[in-house]
């Protein structure tokens, strides 16, 4: 009998009479004992039964022996018998000789005995009686009440065995015999595969089985399961996790689809490629940046690819006898990063701006000239009457990865000591809800005609967030478009042909509210 897996996954069937197509061909002894009778079920399929009803005569001893059954990998064997047993009370005139039990025997052997049959050598497993539980089975037009009994045999040590059924005077139909052993079936738990495993004969001890990770998975902790006597897997320990580029779907690791990635081993899902990155292949651990975009060494794979910033904007300077202050606005495009820094490169140029040379080490930059995080730098120790060209570069964490030249904005400063001095005191001539009229003292020294004044102002409450500026040719101005009852900060610089002065100190003025009269006052100097 060749074993095959039944519908119960933890059973390996060695014999199932309901699946045998031809005659069973079991041995009966004596000849007028058990009878092979083929019934038909409701689907017109043959059911091979053995029947005996020798209830008239006493001292019955009718034997039925199976063919040789290979034990396969089993040690403990289970025998499931389905039978119908007639109640002796239904044949009242045979009460002395009628029995309601039969006996199950077995014998181990390494090979088939052929037709040789010696009942005396067989070992009794048990006496089988009908219990109160029945299952119903359709046999053609008849519904049969079937008893099911299961018995254990083992340990079996030889290659195979025979079963034998002894009738001692019952009226019985043996409708099916199923012989099987239990195994813990191949299973996948926590992404680890565990092979078919035969339980120990000793039902109190478990078999420890080490699992192997499914394809594209790796061990996190050594995966183990324990195989119990009934073919059940118990006590899962450890696990496997899907490798980079793979995600768990229904117990196996599947490659991330194009456009998705997974950077780390684990049981997380694949993620969509972050902005400005893509992948066109499966099982990607990191998405590749689009042209012109980069990923810094310490950027996690989940971060969007970024690019170098554009050039700084609105570069301006203030100069006096000893210091030159360069200021600028951040670039319009930061490249998608926050780690923005600036570098200032100084060049000395002649009249021909193509003839420039490095400024050398004579200049001092406060706080420094590279890696600046603020939008200004102070330049000291410059030489008079020189054209300095300052290139202000914006950089971020991926600037070094780009082969494109770094974007910069340049400003040229002429270091004339003839630059105008600062204006004197500033005052408010009048104020309305939306306007301020301001005037100030012209600078004591201007070295030439004053071309105009640049007035820079902003709300005190929003200092340096945004500012406005206006120009005036006279030392007075009316600033309009202001908010009522709001304090503004003003500072002014002078422009002559030789350049700008530095900015004045800051003056503070307030617009009127709805009830105030126009009033004049001295400006409050802010230190």
């Amino acid at each position: 009998w060749t074993g095959d897996c039944s519908h119960v996954s933890n059973q390996v069937v060695l014999l199932d009479t309901t699946t045998v197509m031809g005659e069973l061909g079991w041995k009966t002894y004596p000849l007028n004992g058990w009878d092979a009778i083929t019934e038909m079920d409701e689907h017109n399929r043959p059911i091979h039964t053995y029947q005996v009803c020798n209830v008239m005569e006493p001292n019955q001893n009718n034997w039925l022996r199976t063919n040789w059954i290979s034990r396969d990998a089993a040690q403990k064997i289970y025998v499931e018998m389905k039978f119908t047993l007639r109640d002796c009370n239904s044949i009242p005139w045979v009460l002395g000789t009628c029995k309601e039990t039969f006996n199950l025997y077995y014998i181990e052997s390494d090979e088939s005995h052929g037709t040789k049959f010696k009942p005396s050598q067989y070992i009794k497993i048990d006496t089988i009686a009908a219990d109160e539980s029945f299952t119903q089975m359709d046999l053609g037009d008849r519904i049969l009440k079937l008893n099911t009994e299961i018995r254990e045999v083992g340990p079996i040590e030889r290659k195979g065995f025979y079963l034998a059924f002894q009738d001692i005077g019952a009226c019985i139909a043996l409708v099916s015999v199923r012989v099987f052993y239990k195994k813990c079936p191949f299973t996948v738990r926590n992404l680890a595969m565990f092979p078919d495993t035969i339980p120990r004969v000793d039902s109190s001890s478990l078999v420890e089985v080490r699992g192997s990770c499914v394809k594209s998975a790796e061990e996190r902790d050594t995966p183990k399961l324990y195989c119990g006597a009934d073919g059940d897997w118990l006590v899962p320990l450890g696990r496997c996790i899907c490798s980079t580029g793979y995600e768990e779907i229904e117990g196996s690791c599947h490659a991330c689809r194009p456009g998705f990635y997974k950077a780390f081993a684990g049981n997380t899902k694949c993620s969509k490629c972050p902005p400005h990155s893509s992948t066109y292949v499966e099982a990607t651990s990191v998405c590749h940046c689009e042209k012109g975009y980069f990923r810094a060494e310490k950027d996690p794979p989940s971060m969007a690819c970024t690019r170098p910033p554009s050039a700084p904007r609105n570069v301006a300077f203030n100069i006096n006898e000893t210091a030159l202050i360069l200021e600028w606005s951040p670039p319009s495009d930061t490249g998608g990063r926050k780690d923005l820094t600036y570098s200032v490169i100084c060049k000395k140029c002649g009249l021909d701006t193509t003839q420039c040379e490095d400024c050398g080490g004579g200049l001092r930059f406060i706080p420094r000239h590279t890696g600046l995080i603020n939008n200004s730098v102070v330049v000291l120790d410059f030489v008079s009457h020189v054209n300095y060209t300052f290139e202000i570069e914006a950089m971020n964490g991926v600037s070094e990865l780009s082969i494109s030249p770094k974007p910069f904005t340049a400003i040229t400063v002429t270091t004339d000591h003839d630059a105008p001095s600062l204006i004197g005191m500033m005052r408010k001539d009048w104020a309305s809800q939306n306007s301020l009229a301001l005037s100030w003292q012209a600078p004591a020294f201007s070295n030439g005609a004053i071309l105009d004044y640049e007035i820079k102002y902003y709300e005190k409450e929003h200092e340096q967030l945004t500012y406005s500026s206006t120009r005036s040719k006279a030392p007075s101005v009316i600033v309009t478009g202001l908010k009522p009852a709001t304090t503004y900060i003003f500072h002014i610089r002078v422009r002559t042909a030789t350049g700008y002065s530095g900015y004045s100190q800051k003056f503070e003025f307030e617009t009127g509210d709805e009830t105030s009269d126009m009033a004049a006052e001295q400006g409050q100097i802010l230190v």
Epitope: N54, V55, M56, G96, C171
Partner: antibody, heavy 121, light 106 residues
Framework: QVQLLQSGAEVKKPGASVKVPCKAS????????MSWVRQAPGQGLEWMGW????????TYAQGFTGRFVFSLDTSVSTAYLQISSLKAEDTAVYYC??????????????WGQGTLVTVSS | EIVLTQSPATLSVSPGERATLSCRAS??????LAWYQQKPGQAPRLLIY???TRATGIPDRFSASGSGTDFTLTISRVEPEDFAVYYC????????FGQGTKVEIK
């Protein structure tokens, strides 16, 4: 081949007795009970009873007690039906039939050819 | 004693037709019922036992069903050799026969 052989027709006077033999062959006689069935001319079947061929213990149906006796001679695998004090209404064909017991039910699966007993003065 | 009543007393059918015979018990006999066929001048022949199990050698055009008190014998397509008298018999308590149903050619 399994068969039951009965004797030929009998003509008896009222008050007489008759013994109808039924010889079995082709099977173990003591493994099956033997039943007796009567069929009056133009009538249906009437079960008379049976005998346990192993123990010789007879069971009689209602209306067949007293004058009717079932007996055996197992040495020659033969069952007998004896009717005493015959009456005209005993005129009938008498069949012996083997009782087959199975787990699914019982039936008389092998029949003798019948013996016609005629009671007439 | 248990009385078995068969109906109809006579059933006229043509060969190839279906014949359905009924047997009703005066009290439950479970599945302890047999059917016999008897042709003129012959001994009866066992067709069915256990209410629905065909005896050895009986063609599958004969089928039977029922339990308790109501039983049916069906001949799916009547053959010429099937014209005979049919008896039901119970063995639930003592044994009794029904009075018979004659199946004749229409």
């Amino acid at each position: 081949q399994v068969q039951l052989l009965q004797s030929g027709a009998e003509v008896k006077k009222p008050g007489a007795s008759v013994k109808v033999p039924c010889k079995a062959s082709g099977y173990t006689f003591t493994s099956y009970a033997m039943s007796w069935v009567r069929q009056a001319p133009g009538q249906g079947l009437e079960w008379m009873g049976w005998i346990n061929t192993n123990t010789g213990n007879p069971t009689y149906a209602q209306g067949f007690t007293g004058r009717f006796v079932f007996s055996l001679d197992t040495s020659v695998s033969t069952a007998y039906l004896q009717i005493s004090s015959l009456k005209a209404e005993d005129t009938a064909v008498y069949y012996c039939a083997r009782v087959r017991l199975t787990v699914y039910g019982d039936g008389m699966d092998v029949w003798g050819q019948g013996t016609l007993v005629t009671v007439s003065s | 004693e248990i009385v078995l009543t068969q109906s109809p007393a006579t059933l006229s059918v043509s060969p190839g037709e279906r014949a359905t015979l009924s047997c009703r018990a005066s009290q439950s006999v479970s599945s302890n019922l047999a059917w016999y066929q008897q042709k003129p001048g012959q001994a009866p022949r066992l067709l069915i036992y256990g209410a629905s199990t065909r005896a050895t050698g009986i063609p599958d055009r004969f089928s039977a069903s029922g339990s308790g008190t109501d039983f049916t014998l069906t001949i799916s397509r009547v053959e010429p050799e099937d014209f005979a008298v049919y008896y039901c018999q119970q063995y639930g308590s003592s044994w009794t026969f029904g009075q018979g149903t004659k199946v004749e050619i229409k």
